[in-house]
Structure formats: structure tokens, C-alpha cells
């Protein structure tokens, strides 16, 4: 037996992190996002659950809704009507999938100081929202959309086709929620509250994924979800718009699909209201390299929505799929005709373009070997966006302003020099016309949220600076974090290395690679985190490395699209390349290298362990994908095409984890999965296990009964991380 090696941080009054610290969330941080209700006013839920109103200009603040009112219905969330007369209170939150949940809603009348009693809302509701003006309510109940002109009025039923697991109105089905919309809703009010647009998803022909939910009963329940796997029948989508002023006179009007899209299988990807009678729809071919943006206008005379061909804008990728993870959405100018949009330039970097008439005549307004990430707000004279331009670090985010008024266009970085060491990764939240905005900095130092003047960019006040967290971390030995790049051939790979306290280059340390590596993801980010891997470095003396290989985002399409139609090849190759480079650095114990990942990361870690290189002693895969045929159509096909003989079946087959079962013989493999995973089905791990058994390869496994893709219930999470810690310490011969 090899002697166990115990890592002891040297004489220091500071203590190392413990696993308990991580599991208890002792070192979690806070952010502050104002809930804007006007150009200079916002709401915020206080620590003690009062809903507080703030006016930036008058410095006025008062409780608009007390915690006792919240508590009276066990409310955990709220929403103020635009006319400020009512608040909906949300309680009985019941999670469904990643974004979706059902809840009970109560309407509180702020004028009377009491709950609205007449025509109470049914329960549970799938989605509810106020109109942008006044206090109309739209909600989805049992897959149908209802409308209330006022909270106390009887509801008007807009759709009648809704049926569980068959037809969804105003809410997405599973695959659209997870892979296309990334929301729990599929309805959008026009800016003046006159029209309501919504999507109908017909899942009648979609195959069902069924799995057992064990619960506490004598018999398990079966969960059935229409879930199109790669190559399967997809949802049929239709978009409708209803006039909410006279919903009974004229029914919902269908918005036509562009001809070039309707000719084969297609997806709806997003809807953006441009003005009160103009709407912009985005569509995508099933083979996701062609996207069409269609601008439609209301024709009063026909009582219909018209989408002229000359208002169709095509975006096409010749090297991969359209867009990043999703196709970007347009940010329209005040003229309701021209818009700004992020898409790839001729060098393959995603940049902001200004489209006035045709995409061909688009004016590129950002350029360089970096990428524009998101357009936050377009006003009369400014455009605010985020990018990773500053100092050439792809894992940073700064906020920029481009002046677009009556002077030469100029670009200014709003955040680059604010708190340069502490803050290198920002997002922002703007008031309606950007008179004020909040900046939320996620690190690499302690997160901080600040309020700013939209004209001058001056900081007005600190909203949250995580003082308590700063104090509680004073006596903690945190590891050192480095973000650097390594070169191999013509490729550059950014990596983040987490080094144990008192790290000594002349010593040898075990190495754990944490990998995700999915297309258009990014792991090497300049953000603050105290999590499991922080603990492993701090307490157990393990060096942790995260590497962004080919297929990851924000470094141009050449790097991103390298994995197109061949998932599982370069992502793995690049992790292996990085490990070899880390060994060359001289402080890694070659005999003690491990890899772990979750979801796509579980797929990559499994393939890396089965690479036959002998680099890894052990590894963990949590909820891994094992074959792209088992995963959702929208995701798998975006990157892999179709699993058909005349398309890409061959690579679907040879990129499975099962195909490499034999290669697990010389590694210690821990396979973990939740049995109620609606996303990456337990089937994936069941098939890996079956292949390993068939190959007579020993491995370790753990399932989590009734846990989904996040394995997030308190007890399960504690068990999971404790179990993985034991496995790793055993692998690295670290004593308990």
C-alpha cells in the first residue's frame, strides 16, 4: 500500500474551508437587481421580506407591501401592476422543469389594503403576468390562456385547445422550455397592452419518455413527458395574436410562417414586440443553420397580421449552427424599423450589426478578435452592450456604451476601470430608457452591486457589497486563482487554476480537472466562487484546473464550430492536451490526476477517462449524456445534425460512451445519476453501466432516487458531495 499523503496548510491562524462550509452555503454571496417600475423608481424585497419602493431622484423610500401581508398568504414573490393599483402575490411554488413551476396567486388591492375577493384565480396557475399598461391579467391554467380586464372581473378564456402533455398554449413544452426559449412562458403583451401574442405547441405526435417516481407509496408513479430525442417527431408550433380589447369579437389571429421556413420542419425561436401594431418573430429550420427574422404588421382592414417578404431577414451559418447557444434577438430602434443584432462577422466573431433595410447592407458597429455578448438597451442616443474585449480575456464581461446620437459614433467602456481588481465580470439592469442602471459585478473579487446615472455613468450608491461575507472570509484560507492561457500548435486554450494555500511550485500536487465543455459554454470566467472545488484546494491540497477547449464560446466561430457534427472528439482532445501541459509545469503528481464533470461534463469526463492515454487515475461522471441519440432533438441536432444514414448517424454511433466501455478497465470510474432526471434521462447512465458490465469492467456507481438533473435536494446534495469527496481522497491516497 502506498502511504497516505495528508495536505496540511502551514502555520497560519486562518482555517481551511470545510466540506460542511460548502454544503451549508456559509459563503454564499448576494446580488441586488432593482425591480424597475419607471425611469427612476424601483422595488426591492428586503431581507425581512418587505417590498420597498425607492425613488432615486427624491431619495424617497417606503414599504409598498408589508411582510405581514406577504406572510398572510405565505407569498415568496410578487408583481406590481403597471398602474400601481394591484400586486399579485405568489405562493405554493411547485417546481416543474428548469424554468417552469406552478403556483397559487392572490391579488392584493393597494388602494383598499385588502385582497381582491371576486372571481379568485384558479389554482395551480402555470404562468401569470400583468399587461404592460394598466392592470389586465393574462394567465395560463391547465394549458389554456385566460384574460382578466381587471383583477376583480370574470376571466375570459382565450384558448380551448389546451390538454395535458398534448397541447400547450402560452407555455412551452419540455423541449422548447429547455432548449429554445429558456423561459416558463410563451406569451407576450404588445407594449400598449392591446394585443397578446402566444404560441401553441402541439405535442400529440411526440414520443413519450416515461420514468418511475418512487415517492412513498406502495407503487411508484410513472412520469410521462413528451420529449423528442434526436431525429424524433418534434412539436408543431403556431403563433397567434389576440386583441385583448375585444377578445370575444375576433378570435386569435395566426401569424404566417415565412415560406422558406415552412417548407420543412422548423422551430419558432422568439417573439419581440416592436411597437403596438408591429411584431417581430424569429424562426429556425430544423437543421439549425438558417434563421429567419420576420417583421409583421397589423392590417386593420383585413383584421390580420401581414409579414411581407421584404421584411424577412435571413441569417445563415456556413460553418456551423446559427447564433451562439441561441439565435440572438433584435434590439429595435425608436423608428420601429431598424434594429441591432449580434451575429457573426466575416471573420467569424459575434458582433453587433445595425440593420436598416437588409442583412446584406448591415453596418457592423463592433469589430475585433473578441465577441459582443449581449445588447442591454438601445435608447435615442446610446446603445449599451457587454463584451469580452477588455485586455483580451474571453472570460471577462464589461459593459460598454456606444453613442449613437448627433455626434460621431463613439465607444466607451463604462466598467473597465471602476474596480479593476475586484470586478472584471459584470452584468447590468437598466431602467426603461436607461436614465439609471444597476451594475452587478460577479468577481473575481467579492460581488458588488451599484447604482449609476445613465447620462454620466457616475456611481450613485452601493446597493450590496457583501460586507458580512467579507468578514466571514477573513479567517479562511482561500486558494489562489489564476486565469492564464496555454498554446498548443496553432490553438490557444484559456484555463483557470485553483492552487492550494501556500502552494509551492517545487512540490507535487494531485490534480483534478473539472470539465463541462459543451458547445457555446464557458468555464473559465473571472467570477467569485466558494464551492466544492474551492474546498478541495483549500483543505485537501488538490490543484484544480478548468480548461475551455474547442467548442466553447466567445472566442470566434473557428473555435466554436470546430466541434460541429463531431461532438466528443475535440472537447476531450483539448482536455488531454491541457493535462499534458500541466504536467510539464512540474508541480503535478502524474500518478494522481482525476477528472470530473456533470451533464455534458459527465460525457466529456467519461470519454477522457476512456481515452486510453493513461493520464487519469480516476474520475467521476454525474448525470452524463452517453449517446446523443438519447438527448433532446433541438440540442443534439443543432450540433450533430440528424441520426440518419444519409446525415450523421455514423458519428452519433461512434461518439457514445458505451462504444468505449473496454477502455475503462484501467481507471477508477464513479458513475452518478438521479433516477428522476427529466433532462438527461437515467437511461444514459443505465446504458453506460450495461456496457461496462457486458465488458466485465469494474466501476462504482451511485443513484439518487427521485432526484432530477440537479440532484439538489438538501440531503441528496450532501450525500453526493460527501460521496465524491471520499472517492477522490481514496483515489489520491489522502487520509480522512
Amino acid at each position: 500500500l502506498r502511504p497516505s499523503r495528508v495536505y496540511k496548510p502551514e502555520g497560519n491562524t486562518k482555517r481551511a474551508l470545510t466540506l460542511k462550509d460548502i454544503l451549508n452555503g456559509t459563503f454564499s454571496y448576494k446580488t441586488y437587481f432593482p425591480n424597475w417600475i419607471s425611469e427612476q423608481e424601483y422595488l426591492h424585497q428586503s431581507e425581512d421580506d418587505n417590498i420597498v419602493f425607492y425613488n432615486i431622484e427624491t431619495r424617497e423610500s417606503y414599504i409598498i407591501l408589508s411582510n405581514s401581508t406577504m406572510k398572510s398568504v405565505n407569498a415568496t414573490d410578487y408583481g406590481l401592476s403597471p398602474d400601481r393599483q394591484f400586486v399579485y402575490l405568489e405562493s405554493d411554488y411547485s417546481k416543474l422543469w428548469r424554468y417552469s413551476y406552478t403556483a397559487t396567486y392572490y391579488i392584493y388591492d393597494l388602494q383598499n389594503g385588502e385582497f381582491v375577493r371576486g372571481y379568485e384565480l384558479p389554482r395551480p396557475i402555470q404562468y401569470l403576468c400583468w399587461s404592460p399598461v394598466g392592470s389586465k391579467l393574462a394567465y395560463v391554467y391547465q394549458n389554456n390562456i385566460y384574460l382578466k380586464q381587471r383583477p376583480g372581473d370574470p376571466p375570459f378564456q382565450i384558448t380551448y385547445t389546451g390538454r395535458e402533455n398534448r397541447i400547450f398554449n402560452g407555455i412551452p413544452d419540455w423541449v422548447y422550455e429547455e432548449e429554445m426559449l429558456a423561459t416558463k412562458y410563451a406569451l407576450w403583451w404588445s407594449p400598449d397592452g392591446k394585443f397578446l401574442a402566444y404560441v401553441e405547441f402541439n405535442d400529440s405526435d411526440i414520443p413519450i419518455i416515461a420514468y418511475s417516481y418512487y415517492g412513498d407509496g406502495q407503487y411508484p408513479r410513472t412520469i410521462n413527458i413528451p420529449y423528442p430525442k434526436a431525429g424524433a417527431k418534434n412539436p408543431v408550433v403556431r403563433v397567434f395574436i389576440v386583441d385583448t380589447t375585444y377578445p370575444h369579437h375576433v378570435g386569435p389571429m395566426e401569424v404566417p410562417v415565412p415560406e422558406m421556413i415552412a417548407s420543412s420542419d422548423y422551430y419558432f425561436s422568439w417573439l419581440t414586440w416592436v411597437s403596438s401594431e408591429r411584431v417581430c418573430l424569429q424562426w429556425l429550420k430544423r437543421v439549425q443553420n438558417v434563421s429567419v427574422l420576420s417583421i409583421c404588421d397589423f392590417r386593420e382592414d383585413w383584421h390580420a397580421w401581414e409579414c411581407p417578404k421584404n421584411q424577412e431577414h435571413v441569417e445563415e451559418s456556413r460553418t456551423g449552427w446559427a447564433g451562439g447557444f441561441f439565435v440572438s434577438t433584435p434590439a429595435f430602434s425608436q423608428d420601429a424599423t431598424s434594429y441591432y443584432k449580434i451575429f457573426s462577422d466575416k471573420d467569424g466573431y459575434k458582433h453587433i450589426h445595425y440593420i436598416k433595410d437588409t442583412v446584406e447592407n448591415a453596418i457592423q458597429i463592433t469589430s475585433g478578435k473578441w465577441e459582443a455578448i449581449y445588447i442591454f438597451r438601445v435608447t435615442q442616443d446610446s446603445l449599451f452592450y457587454s463584451s469580452n474585449e477588455f485586455e483580451g480575456y474571453p472570460g471577462r464581461r464589461n459593459i460598454y456604451r456606444i453613442s449613437i446620437g448627433n455626434s460621431p459614433p463613439s465607444k466607451k467602456c463604462v466598467t473597465c476601470h471602476l474596480r479593476k481588481e475586484r470586478c472584471q465580470y459584470y452584468t447590468a439592469s437598466f431602467s426603461y430608457k436607461a436614465k439609471y442602471y444597476a451594475l452587478v459585478c460577479y468577481g473575481p473579487g467579492l460581488p458588488i452591486s451599484t447604482l449609476h446615472d445613465g447620462r454620466t455613468d457616475q456611481e450613485i450608491q452601493v446597493l450590496e457589497e457583501n460586507k458580512e461575507l467579507e468578514n466571514s472570509l477573513r479567517n479562511i484560507q482561500l486558494p489562489k486563482v489564476e486565469i492564464k492561457k496555454l498554446k498548443d500548435g496553432g490553438l490557444t486554450f484559456w484555463y483557470k487554476m485553483i492552487l492550494p494555500p501556500q502552494f509551492d511550485r517545487s512540490k507535487k500536487y494531485p490534480l483534478l480537472i473539472q470539465v463541462y465543455g459543451g458547445p457555446c459554454s464557458q468555464s473559465v470566467k473571472s467570477v467569485f466562487a466558494v464551492n466544492w472545488i474551492t474546498y478541495l484546494a483549500s483543505k485537501e491540497g488538490i490543484v484544480i484546473a478548468l480548461v475551455d477547449g474547442r467548442g466553447t464560446a466567445f472566442q470566434g466561430d473557428k473555435f466554436l464550430h470546430a466541434v460541429y457534427r463531431k461532438l466528443g472528439v475535440y472537447e476531450v482532445e483539448d482536455q488531454l492536451t491541457a493535462v499534458r501541459k500541466f504536467i510539464e509545469m512540474g508541480f503535478i503528481d502524474e500518478e494522481r490526476i482525476a477528472i470530473w464533470g456533470w451533464s455534458y461534463g459527465g460525457y466529456v469526463s467519461s470519454l477522457a477517462l476512456a481515452s486510453g492515454t493513461g493520464l487519469f487515475k480516476c474520475g467521476i461522471a454525474v448525470a452524463p449524456v452517453s449517446s446523443w441519440e438519447y438527448y433532446a432533438s433541438i440540442y443534439s441536432e443543432r450540433f450533430m445534425g440528424l441520426p440518419t444514414k444519409d446525415d450523421n448517424l455514423e458519428h452519433y454511433k461512434n461518439s457514445t460512451v458505451m462504444a468505449r466501455a473496454e477502455y475503462f478497465r484501467n481507471v477508477d470510474y464513479l458513475l452518478i445519476h438521479g433516477t428522476a432526471d427529466d433532462n438527461v434521462h437515467f437511461q444514459n447512465s443505465a446504458q453506460i453501466a450495461k456496457a461496462l458490465v457486458n465488458a466485465q469492467v469494474d466501476f462504482q456507481a451511485m443513484w439518487y432516487s427521485d432526484q432530477n438533473h440537479g440532484i439538489s435536494s438538501g440531503r441528496s446534495q450532501n450525500h453526493l458531495y460527501t460521496h465524491m469527496t471520499h472517492f477522490l481522497k481514496q483515489c489520491f491516497s489522502l487520509s480522512d
Epitope: 449613437i404 460621431p408 459614433p409
Partner: antibody, heavy 121, light 107 residues
Amino acid sequence: QVQLQQPGAELVKPGASVKLSCKASGYTITSYSLHWVKQRPGQGLEWIGEINPANGDHNFSEKFEIKATLTVDSSSNTAFMQLSRLTSEDSAVYYCTRLDDSRFHWYFDVWGAGTTVTVSS
Amino acid sequence: QIVLTQSPALMSASPGEKVTMTCTASSSVSYMYWYQQKPRSSPKPWIFLTSNLASGVPARFSGRGSGTSFSLTISSMEAEDAATYYCQQWSGYPPITFGSGTKLEIK
């Protein structure tokens, strides 16, 4: 089509003044700002200044603030630049050019053929 | 004021050759603009907002850069591309400044 017409040449004596014209055709002069650019023989381009024909507002390069005067006669759709106290250093080709300041353009889209000014006794 | 330095001052290229000329600003600018001028002719707008080709400019031309470093590239030199190219910026406006020019000749 849109054009800016400038006389071909002006011969002036040192110490004198010259008034260069720039006649716009194909568009209304008050719709766009007009800039003047100097180019000495075999040399690069040097910005002199600009005038907004709609309101007469102007900006100059510091170097030309005393040297140049910019005016517009909207009735004849013509812009003028007067150069005073001329020296041999002022011998150059002078271009008038229109600024396309539509959103995100901001470039000089139409140029006159240039007037060659020769300062010689 | 912002000074623009163009390099090289003079260069020659054979037909089909890739050509790159640079423009360096003395301090950071938001965007760069380029003009082409042929002998005895007025300048013509060539590239605006760093990377956009003006109307009628062949697709073999491209513009790149940010901060203080900008470039104009011709992917495959043609005889008609022989000219002097000037960069120009608005960031210190007023004044507007031009670079001293790069004269491109055909071999």
C-alpha cells in the same frame, strides 16, 4: 446625381485673401454639414474645419482658426471658405466634402474635385 | 489631438498578393475610417466604422482593429488597388485627424 463643384485653380499673391467656392448640386446644401480639407503637394490630408449650413455653426482645427472663414449661401446652394494672409505654406489643393452623418456612417461621402491654390508673387 | 501613424509609408505588391497596412493612434479611438486616393483625384470613402466597406468597394478589402491599432487588408491585390490610403478618426473631434497615408504600388 450628388456633386460638389469647385473651381480648378486660384493664383493669389502673398498676404492677400482668397474665397473658395463649393457648389452643391443634387441635394439641398442645408441637409448635410460641409468640411474643408487641405492637401499640400505630395502630402497627406489635413482637416481645416466644418460648417453646418443649416445654422452656420462651425468648428475649426486650432491651426486654421485665424486663417479660415466658413460661410454658406443657401439660396445658391454654395459654401465658401475664405483664406486670409496667404503665404507659400498655404499653397495646396483645397477640397470641400460632404459628411454623411446618417446613423453609423459619419464619413465624407462626396468630395469636390479640389481647388488648387497657388500663392506666388 | 490624436495623431495617426500609418505604416509603411510606401509599399508594393504583386497581383494576387495579400496586403496589410496599419494605422496606429496615439491614444485609444472608437472607430477608424479609411479613404482611397489616386493621383490627380479626390479621396474616396473606402472603409467606415473600422470594418464596413463603403458603397462600391470590392469585397477583397477588409478593415480591422480596436483601441490604438487598426489595419486595412486586401486579400488579393489587383492593379486597380494601387493608390494612397489614408486613415481618419473622429474620437478627438474636433479636430478630425488623418494619417499621413500609405502609398500602395503594383509590382
